[in-house]
Amino acid sequence: QPPPPPPDATCHQVRSFFQRLQPGLKWVPETPVPGSDLQVCLPKGPTCCSRKMEEKYQLTARLNMEQLLQSASMELKFLIIQNAAVFQEAFEIVVRHAKNYTNAMFKNNYPSLTPQAFEFVGEFFTDVSLYILGSDINVDDMVNELFDSLFPVIYTQLMNPGLPDSALDINECLRGARRDLKVFGNFPKLIMTQVSKSLQVTRIFLQALNLGIEVINTTDHLKFSKDCGRMLTRMWYCSYCQGLMMVKPCGGYCNVVMQGCMAGVVEIDKYWREYILSLEELVNGMYRIYDMENVLLGLFSTIHDSIQYVQKNAGKLTTTIGKLCAHSQQRQYR
Amino acid sequence: SAYYPEDLFIDKKVLKVAHVEHEETLSSRRRELIQKLKSFISFYSALPGYICSHSPVAENDTLCWNGQELVERYSQKAARNGMKNQFNLHELKMKGPEPVVSQIIDKLKHINQLLRTMSMPKGRVLDKNLDEEGFESGDCGDDEDECIGGSGDGMIKVKNQLRFLAELAYDLDVDDAPGNSQQATPKDNEISTFHNLGNVH
């Protein structure tokens, strides 16, 4: 470290160091002045600082503070941003796999239902993806729509293959009958429960991660108050006015200043702690029907079982539906 | 009984079931994230101290600056004098947080409430309750295994969850330290749908 400089009667030292912050020398006194106009670096005697220099010091101090805050949160911010992206993509891939499993199940077990089934399955899983990303879709409606669309195809292709498949009139009747007669048993309800619970939890998990990013971004880009700027200037730059270029602030003093500057930010602490603990609780509960990976990747099996249920009761159903939708069928055959 | 879906696969491989215990699942990945987040639980309360430790502070010097003058590092003046004649620090604290901070606190309160609601066991319908509704098929036992595949002879059980996603192993600019990646080695009649994602730090 350089030896302590001799007393500076000319402000040469201060002028030189001020150029680091502001090119040119017009704001720096040639020789020490009383400094009665100073508001932050209040002098005990003559000073080498001017009001303009003080303003520049304050601006720099606040920028320093913003940089310190950003570097403090960099690791945390990276952790959440990275994971939010990873989980979002992972969930999309789970949905894609679940759709592929379901399509494969139809292709392998019920080839006569494709390609219509592919279309309905595709729409269902598109809605699932949109829901996870925050779209305002009702899960029960999604599931109902899937079964409402599937049943006419199952009826006309599996249960009653003699019917032409362009039967729009009967399709409407069959859609209605599907719910009234509970043709799929309790399977739609099972799927509703599992899908809605697992997707709700997934959606809120992603929402929580994205809010985490927003919290860090907000505190990262805080503009510090003028009062804080004054405190920081006093701590980091006022020593320069006395030609003390190499001194550092006292530790306890720094803590007092930072607590003053951070008073507002620190108020987040309580809610931040709660956020992490609540997120932990949510994650601990994300299993079985609260785990979308588990639920969606098993959907093809439940859908398969629901179709088997229909086939098992095909005799009864055909008779009942024959009566219920007779009017539509007659019109169609004319 | 349903065939296990095997075509229409992105990789066109026949899907079999993974029982590899060490592979990373979404669930293990979530727990790993929570553990890392918990190390930041005091982030906001620790900020003032963190910033002081990352900005110039007299550590080994005999003298330090207290905002007004050079003082001995361990003297009472070191913390006190610099605060005199500045402005009222108490007043600064009483002003309360900026509007943007208040807004973010409100959002945190809201998400915390949602998270708590979602985590409450009371509101949860367990698989068991659904069994009482009397399905004629499609029932799965209430053990740790989940049923995948139709009921009957061909039913396949998957232990807990299918594993992490092969397609997601994109480069994440993360540590490549040895031992970080837990890539599975599928045995005969096992393929892993999900592979390791790379560790996010």
Epitope: F17, Q67, W236, K248 | P56
Partner: nanobody, 118 residues
Amino acid sequence: QVQLVESGGGLVQPGGSLRLSCAASGFTFSSYAMSWVRQAPGKGLEWVSAISGSGGSTYYADSVKGRFTISRDNSKNTLYLQMNSLRAEDTAVYYCAKEALTGVFDYWGQGTTVTVSS
């Protein structure tokens, strides 16, 4: 343990050139701005030049502008000061300094002496 070690000083004739180096260790070099500061015999400290962490921005005192060039090699953790058209008034001990914050120095080297004389 932060260490800054300057080298490259010596005796040079007016109008001549010298290149000072500063080898840094003990911190993430590329994350910090660095400065050169000098002290002429019997005089106070004088800030000479600064460079941002990435090396993208440079700053000079009026007294050396156009004659001195600051640069850094982050892969080698080294700071440089190329001094051309040297004058007698450039005679000083040259220190390299780590900037903890803009214009706030927390670590200094031990200095290297530059003497400009005919």
